[in-house]
């Protein structure tokens, strides 16, 4: 529970409680920002990127966005509260346990973007159509 | 009853050094995950740092990769985090926070200790 010597600020995102006052803890992501990628038709990919950061929010989300254009492909992973957009989209599948790329329309490149809600699932990158489908079997195991 | 109780706080210069701890009472300490937190003046809450039961993995906030470093000693049921290369922005009071068990609930805190970067 929040102690109360802990002092609320007048707009604190920071603090994030359930039902019984307990603290919530931000998700774990990996957070490389924008590295080169070496990710190419492959059905999923690993980031490659060694830093796991915790989220400076505890509503905040793991992002990746992979993108390619005549020059190199690049693949971004942080973290990011699915209330605001990102490179101009929503979030939608915030809530997935997976990251499952979807393709957004952007001019002059091919652009890929997932966000997830497991701890560091922006680690593992999945094109694959056969992940695109709702499937009940896949439980958000958070952080336990 | 579980207790925490945080010492190591004061004074310090920017570049300077401290190390705070945090005892333990009252729980099985080496079964749950810990945290360190902190709340800057007029400011919200930052989770700084994480550790698991047994010590590793540790996780870091951006703002002190690379600077901080959390450690527990479980057959001394106590927490640590040395903190280098301080900066004004680091000046808060810090928090010891245990896990529940469940999600990712923190439910006890401690009452905390004063850091203050200033020259």
């Known amino acids: 529970t929040i102690p109360p010597h802990v002092q609320k600020s007048v707009n604190n995102d920071m603090i994030v409680t359930d039902n019984n006052g307990a603290v919530k803890f931000p998700q774990l992501c990996k957070f490389c920002d924008v590295r080169f990628s070496t990710c190419d038709n492959q059905k999923s990919c690993m980031s490659n990127c060694s830093i796991t950061s915790i989220c400076e929010k505890p509503q905040e989300v793991c992002v990746a966005v992979w993108r390619k254009n005549d020059e190199n492909i690049t693949l971004e992973t942080v973290c990011h509260d699915p209330k605001l957009p990102y490179h101009d989209f929503i979030l939608e599948d915030a809530a997935s346990p997976k990251c499952i790329m979807k393709e957004k329309k952007k001019p002059g490149e091919t652009f890929f973007m997932c966000s997830c809600s497991s701890d560091e699932c922006n680690d593992n990158i999945i094109f694959s159509e056969e992940y695109n489908t709702s499937n009940p079997d896949l439980l958000l195991v958070i952080f336990q | 009853e579980v207790q925490l109780l945080e010492s190591g706080g004061g004074l310090v210069q920017p570049g300077g050094s401290l190390r705070l701890s945090c005892a333990a009472s009252?729980?099985?300490?080496?079964?749950?995950?810990m945290a360190w937190v902190r709340q800057a003046p007029g400011k919200g809450l930052e989770w700084v740092s994480l550790i698991f039961p047994n010590g590793v993995p540790t996780y870091y906030a951006n703002s002190v990769k690379g600077r901080f470093t959390i450690s527990r000693d479980n057959s001394k049921n106590t927490l640590y985090l040395q903190m280098n290369s301080l900066r004004a922005e680091d000046t808060a009071v810090y928090y010891c926070?245990?896990?529940?068990?469940?999600?990712?609930?923190?439910?006890?805190w401690g009452q905390g200790t004063l850091v203050t970067v200033s020259s």
């Open positions: 009252g729980f099985t300490f080496d079964k749950y995950k």
């Open positions: 926070a245990k896990y529940s068990g469940q999600g990712r609930d923190f439910d006890y």
